[in-house]
Each structure stands twice: as C-alpha cells, then as structure tokens.
Interface confidence: low
C-alpha cells in the first residue's frame, strides 16, 4: 500500500458540499459517518488460507487546511496561547487542528476551539463533543449516537504510476437507522484512546472513526515519508501486536520492489 504521491492527481467531489465551502479540491464538506464505517473483520474465509488473509478498508480525511478558522469562543492574544499541531489528535477534545487564517498556509496549523451546533464545519473533528458535521453544519449527535441519512456522490479520478481505477465513482445512499455506541467500531473519535480495545482512530474523507486494528495478512499502508499519511483519503489502522507492515514477497521475482504491503509477523 502506498500513500498518494504528491504528484498523484486526486479529485474528490462530494454532492453535499455547501456553496460556502468551496476552495481546496480536497476540502469540501464532511462525507457523513455512515458511509465510512469500514471493518477489518474477515468473513467467508475461503478454503486453506496459505498466506495473506483479508484486506481492510479504513478511513481518512484529507490533509487539514480549514476554510473556517477559529471556534466559537472568542479568544484574544492575551489569554490564548496557540498550540501548534499537525493533526486533530494533538489537540484537546474541544479543539481541532487547522490553519489559523482563511486559506492560510496549511503548513502552519494550531489547535482551534471546536465549533458549536449550527456552526459551519468540514469534518467531524471541527464540531464540539456531542455534535458531528453533517452537510457542512455541526449538528447534535443525539446522545452520542448517529442516525444514517446520507446521500453522497463521490467521483474520484486518480493518477498513479502503476495504473488507476479510472472512472471509479460511487453513489451511496443510506437511509436506514444505524446507531453506534461511543468508542465502538464506527464511532466518531479524535484519537485512538477514544476507541475501544482493538480499535484505532482513523479517517475517511473528512470523518474520523474507530476502526479495527489490522490482522495478519491484511493490506496495510507503509508511509514512505513522514507526514505522507495526511494525503490519504482512506486511512487504515496500524498492524496489530506482533505484526509489522512489510512488503509482500513476490513469489515470481527476486526483486521486492512491489508496493503491496501486508501485516506480517516480526
């Protein structure tokens, strides 16, 4: 697995994007929770599993860079000491990580106060606890539960040296009621410590949810450069205890230049 290369052209268009949330092509509106729940649980294992097992799908938001800076608490330079950050996990539970200026340098980010109900947002982490981002607005999460009412259209066109999924588009409609207990798989989170045992906090588009830690043989993402995970849009959890993310040995070639990585025993 690899993180998207900087040169890889990635365009994500979400139908729900509010007009006011234009700007960066990767920073539209939150693709709400229920379309993003992914599990690494393996079902229907085929007969003898000689090696690689299942393959996860996990989740991620685009790199931060926020169009609507600041929270709802007006803070002056006198009483507010900016805390630099790279991602939301580094901030408090009532904060999110973003550029402090509209359209500002994404490389300069600080922890900003979370946004209260009915305020504009672009991902769940921007909203204060008890709320989540839906259609660009922070709405109540109904006692930490989420009701699935989504209609999104995502068209992704990827440039990749090793071919692409051209025209890979997906239309997802979810209108069934689905409830998720806080900390369980699918729950919105800020950091992995918010998730139950065996889960990590990972992102999918603009959401961050609890996802299962990867098992042996599952496809994992090996980050070549520090910070490259910020370019992912479907982040995967890390490999479980006793496992590491390593290149899958090619049975037919001596070279190990393949980019396919799986969780393997140390």
């Amino acid at each position: 697995m690899m993180a998207l290369g900087a040169a890889g052209a990635t365009r994500v268009f979400v139908a729900m994007v509010a007009a006011a949330l234009g700007g960066h092509p990767l920073l539209g509106v939150s693709a709400t929770l229920n379309s993003v729940l992914n599990s690494n649980a393996i079902k229907n294992l085929p007969p003898p599993l000689g090696g690689a097992a299942g393959h996860p799908g996990s989740a991620v938001s685009a790199a931060p860079g926020i169009l609507y800076p600041g929270g709802n608490k007006y803070q002056t330079i006198d009483n507010y000491q900016p805390y630099p950050c790279a991602e939301d996990e580094e901030c408090g539970t009532d904060e999110y990580c973003a550029s402090p200026t509209r359209g500002g340098d994404a490389g300069v980010q600080i922890c900003l106060a979370c946004r209260k109900r009915r305020k504009r947002c672009m991902r769940h982490a921007m909203c204060c606890p008890g709320n989540y981002c839906k259609n660009g607005i922070c709405v109540s999460s109904d006692q930490n539960h989420f009701r699935g009412e989504i209609e999104e259209t995502i068209t992704e066109s990827f440039g990749n040296d090793h071919s692409t999924l051209d025209g890979y588009s997906r239309r997802t409609t979810l209108s069934s009621k689905m409830y998720h207990t806080k900390g369980q798989e699918g729950s919105v989170c800020l950091r992995s410590s918010d998730c139950a045992s065996g889960l990590c906090c990972a992102r999918h588009f603009w959401s961050k949810i609890c996802k299962p830690v990867l098992k042996e043989g599952q496809v994992c993402t090996k980050h070549r450069r520090k910070g490259s995970h910020g370019l992912e849009i479907f982040q995967r959890c890390y490999c479980g205890e006793g496992l590491s993310c390593r290149i899958q040995k090619d049975h037919h070639q001596a070279s190990n230049s393949s980019r396919l990585h799986t969780c393997q025993r140390h």
């Epitope: 697995m1 690899m2 993180a3 998207l4 890889g8 990635t10 379309s35 729940l37 992914n38 599990s39 690494n40 649980a41 393996i42 079902k43 229907n44 299942g54 393959h55 996860p56 799908g57 996990s58 991620v60 992704e156 990827f158 440039g159 990749n160 090793h162 071919s163 692409t164 999924l165 890979y168 997906r170 997802t172 979810l174 069934s176 689905m178 798989e185 699918g186 993402t221 370019l231 992912e232 849009i233 479907f234 982040q235 995967r236």
Partner: nanobody, 121 residues
Framework: EVQLVESGGGLVQAGGSLRLSCAAS????????MGWYRQAPGNQRELVAS???????NYVDSVKGRFTISVDSAKNTVYLQMNSLKPEDTAVYYC???????????????WGQGTQVTVSS
C-alpha cells in the same frame, strides 16, 4: 446473505487473455472492493492487485503492465483484466471486499469462492 461470486476463469494458452469478474450479491448497501489474491498449488496465497488507501491501484511486480483491476460500483462488481498470461499465472484467484450489508448493519470482509485460471504453454 451477502456473497462474492467470481467468474471468468478457465484454460487459456500462454499469451492469451482472461477477464475475471467478482460480483457481490445480497443485502448490500455499500460495496468496497479491496483486491484480488491468488494461490498456486504449494504456494501461499498472495495479493496480486489491490486498491490503495488513496483509491488507486497497486500490483505485484510480476503482473505489472499485464493485469488491471477495475470496479463497476453500480453493479457491485470488481474485475481483473489479465493480458499476456504466463504459465506461472496459473492459480486459483480470489476476490476480497468490504461490504456494508443492511441485514447485518455492519461492515464485514468477504471472500469469493475462487476461480481457477490455468495457463498452458
């Protein structure tokens, strides 16, 4: 019940082509295809082509430039186009996908039953 069914395998001469299909059926809300694996006799199962965390595709070195993974989301189907087949491509090919089903109201990882590809020299 959700099922993944592969088809398109068969016997082909070296240099020939096959197109494998993997169709998901059942109470599917969202189909998230992951990749194709293969297992040759006496070998471990290996990942052949996968959809990356960034949504692109990656291939094991031995099939690069010959195999192409693609998806038809409307049909809940993932394909593996295999060109310039070689005898060493002979194996049982399995598809793998994460599926959110309305019956289970959860994401689960599913495997197909496998389809045999035999390349004769």
């Amino acid at each position: 019940e959700v099922q993944l069914v592969e088809s398109g395998g068969g016997l082909v001469q070296a240099g020939g082509s096959l197109r494998l299909s993997c169709a998901a059926s059942g109470s599917i809300v969202t189909f998230n295809p992951m990749g194709w694996y293969r297992q040759a006799p006496g070998n471990q199962r290996e990942l052949v082509a996968s959809i990356t965390s960034g949504g692109g595709a990656n291939y094991v070195d031995s099939v690069k430039g010959r195999f192409t993974i693609s998806v038809d989301s409307a049909k809940n189907t993932v394909y593996l186009q295999m060109n310039s087949l070689k005898p060493e491509d002979t194996a049982v090919y399995y598809c793998n996908a994460d599926i959110f089903s309305s019956s289970r109201l959860s994401w689960d990882n599913y495997w197909g039953q496998g389809t045999q590809v035999t390349v004769s020299s």
